[in-house]
Interface confidence: low
């Protein structure tokens, strides 16, 4: 008699029990976090934690702690019920604890800058370590009122997991307060201080005459010379040098919330806005079969690209994750890991005229800094939740 458990049908360490009463002839008893007849599906189980206004429910990074919501359309709070903050200085003012607000202009429309009392030095005059912040640090959900350098930006929750994006930048210069405020602060215009968020660059943006043309020709496989500038996003990498295989060059894996019905448009928008923001060429990578390297999250391929360590058999044996995460959401939003190629050929000490992060780790710090000061979310088609840089590797030698 054939033992239905002989083929080890249960994934992720599930235990198999042969039973005549089951349609498959066996039952898998799944470990915590997995479900399905063969334990192949991740089960973030948001339970009664419901994400409103299209928000996506994500498992907590800490076992035994609440799931978190990645909110869309500017909504916030643990359940995405907090309405979007007004643009600029409001009302209500985004500056807490009697901070004074001044409006700024930027890529994402009107912004703001807070002038804060010394006792509350966060970008919105938050008080890191304030009452109610204990225990929230590092729980995966950004608590804006607990975000600031003193508390490592809510334990990295508000800065893409990077505890201190300005590490190495002299603290007395307080560049995290001045970052991307629309004014040039020479003391912050260095690699360590993240080039003052490019506030010192001229021209600051792609000229309107070129912008639409460069948008229409972004990463189309042809080098548009007029678009091959930092402020126009280096034509999405179309003009990068031919030497070296782009498949093995540096890349960024981004965990982002997008809406599948408009996925292509959103991927394009994501690549272009990040190219313009970071002043490097960025594009969605393709795999060997010519498919976009975009993977539903959670899922084995997605987590591998994000740098997660796992059982070496996971990839081959895990069923493909086709179910978007967050059955409990009331929208079509879903989590995706998007692998983006990066053209850093114009950055670095050899190109002093092109001031941009010259390695993927610095790109991550720059993105983390933007997230920390609230400058990233308004630009993107959906919340960016994590970034994993890959420095690039040499292609394997041909096996003859």
């Amino acid at each position: 008699e054939i033992d239905p458990c002989h083929s080890q049908p249960c994934f992720h360490g599930g235990t198999c029990e042969a039973t005549a009463g089951s349609p498959l002839g066996f039952i898998c008893h799944c470990p915590k976090g997995f479900e399905g007849p063969t334990c192949s599906h991740r089960a973030p189980s948001c339970g009664f934690h419901h994400c409103h206004h299209g928000g996506l429910c994500l498992p907590s990074p800490k076992p035994g702690f609440p799931p978190r919501c990645a909110c869309l359309s500017g909504y916030g709070g643990p359940d995405c019920l907090t309405p979007p903050a007004p643009k600029g200085c409001g009302p209500p003012s985004p500056c807490l604890y009697n901070g004074s607000c001044s409006e700024t202009t930027g890529l994402g429309g009107p912004g703001f800058r807070c002038s804060c009392p010394h006792s509350s030095p966060g970008p919105r005059c938050q008080k890191p370590g304030a009452k109610g912040c204990e225990g929230r640090s590092g729980d995966g959900a950004c608590d804006a009122g607990c975000s600031g350098p003193g508390g490592n930006w809510d334990g990295g929750d508000c800065s893409l997991g990077v505890p201190d994006p300005w590490k190495g930048c002299p603290s007395h210069s307080r560049c995290w307060l001045l970052f991307r405020d629309g004014q040039c602060h020479p003391q912050c215009d260095s690699e360590e201080c993240l080039f003052d968020g490019y506030d010192c660059e001229t021209p600051p943006a792609c000229t309107p005459a070129y912008d639409q043309y460069c948008h229409d020709h972004f990463h189309n496989g042809h080098c548009e010379k007029g678009c091959n500038t930092a402020e126009c996003g280096w034509d999405g990498g179309d003009c990068r040098p031919e030497d070296g295989d782009p498949e093995w060059g540096p890349s960024l894996a981004l965990l982002v919330v997008l809406s599948p019905p408009a996925l292509d448009q959103q991927l394009f928008a994501l690549a272009r806005v990040l190219s313009l923001t970071l002043r490097v060429g960025l594009w969605v990578r393709k795999d060997r079969d010519g498919r976009d390297m975009v993977y539903p999250y959670p899922g084995a391929r997605a987590e591998e690209k994000l740098g997660g360590t796992r059982d070496p058999t996971y990839q081959e044996r895990a069923a493909p994750q086709t179910q978007p995460l967050g059955k409990e959401t009331d929208s079509l939003s879903a989590g995706f890991v998007v692998v983006m190629g990066v053209d850093l050929s114009r950055c670095g000490p050899d190109h002093p005229a092109s001031r941009c992060p010259w390695d993927p780790g610095l790109l991550l710090r720059f993105l983390a800094a933007m997230a920390a000061v609230g400058a990233l979310e308004p630009l993107l088609p959906g919340p960016l939740l994590a970034v994993h840089p890959h420095a690039g590797t040499a292609p394997p030698a041909n096996q003859l």
Partner: antibody
Framework: EVQLVESGGGLVQPGGSLRLSCAAS????????MSWVRQAPGKGLELVAT????????YYPDSVKGRFTISRDNSKNTLYLQMGSLKAEDMAVYYC????????WGQGTLVTVSS | DIQMTQSPSSLSASVGDRVTITCKAS??????VAWYQQKPGKVPKLLIY???TRHTGVPSRFSGSGSGTDFTLTISSLQPEDVATYYC?????????FGQGTKVEIK
């Protein structure tokens, strides 16, 4: 408005069987895990069975394992509890409840086990 | 299974008093703890989930705290309508388990 309505309780002899139903309305039933919780007269609350949103996973405490089966029909928005080999200690009010933090409960149905 | 041990099993306090009920888990449950109120002859009602989050419509005099193995439900100012039995519950590991209950009465 979320509503959970249990039915199927009644008097049964020891060793007998009973099937409880819970009709759900006012929310997307197929998106939520569901549970049965019981309360013996004058006693505390005890979780009897839990099922995840798609019916793929079920959980039971040792006290009912092998005797009770929880199931659901998402097309009918209905949760079931098939109880077998009933004992005197199974006598209780049986509630169906939504989620792991039971924010919503039915009014309960009484199961009496007596000869 | 994880045991949830509540104390005291019953208490009597005056209106306006601060009342504290504790719940100890036999192993670490993170913050996956809920508290319920059950009035005589009524269905249990969710008060607190994730250890400290008040459920919609629950008066602010009810608060929860704790993580790991030790949890507390506090009623800051006891009211006559708070006479009930209170239960803690863990939902960190299956099967989810309840404490044995704490009966609160007015002196």
């Amino acid at each position: 408005e979320v509503q959970l309505v249990e039915s199927g309780g009644g008097l049964v002899q020891p060793g007998g069987s009973l099937r409880l139903s819970c009709a759900a309305s006012g929310f997307t039933f197929s998106s939520y895990g569901m549970s049965w919780v019981r309360q013996a007269p004058g006693k505390g609350l005890e979780l009897v069975a839990t099922i995840n949103s798609n019916g793929g996973r079920t959980y039971y405490p040792d006290s009912v394992k092998g005797r009770f089966t929880i199931s659901r029909d998402n097309s009918k928005n209905t949760l079931y509890l098939q109880m077998g080999s009933l004992k005197a200690e199974d006598m209780a009010v049986y509630y169906c409840a939504r989620d792991q933090g039971f924010a919503y409960w039915g009014q309960g149905t009484l199961v009496t086990v007596s000869s | 299974d994880i045991q949830m041990t509540q104390s005291p099993s019953s208490l009597s306090a005056s209106v306006g008093d601060r009342v504290t009920i504790t719940c100890k888990a036999s192993q670490d449950v993170g913050t996956a703890v809920a508290w319920y109120q059950q009035k005589p002859g009524k269905v249990p009602k969710l008060l607190i989930y994730w250890a400290s989050t008040r459920h919609t419509g629950v008066p602010s005099r009810f608060s929860g705290s704790g993580s790991g193995t030790d949890f507390t439900l506090t009623i800051s100012s006891l009211q006559p309508e708070d006479v009930a039995t209170y239960y803690c519950q863990q939902y960190s590991s299956y099967p989810w388990t309840f404490g044995q209950g704490t009966k609160v009465e007015i002196k």
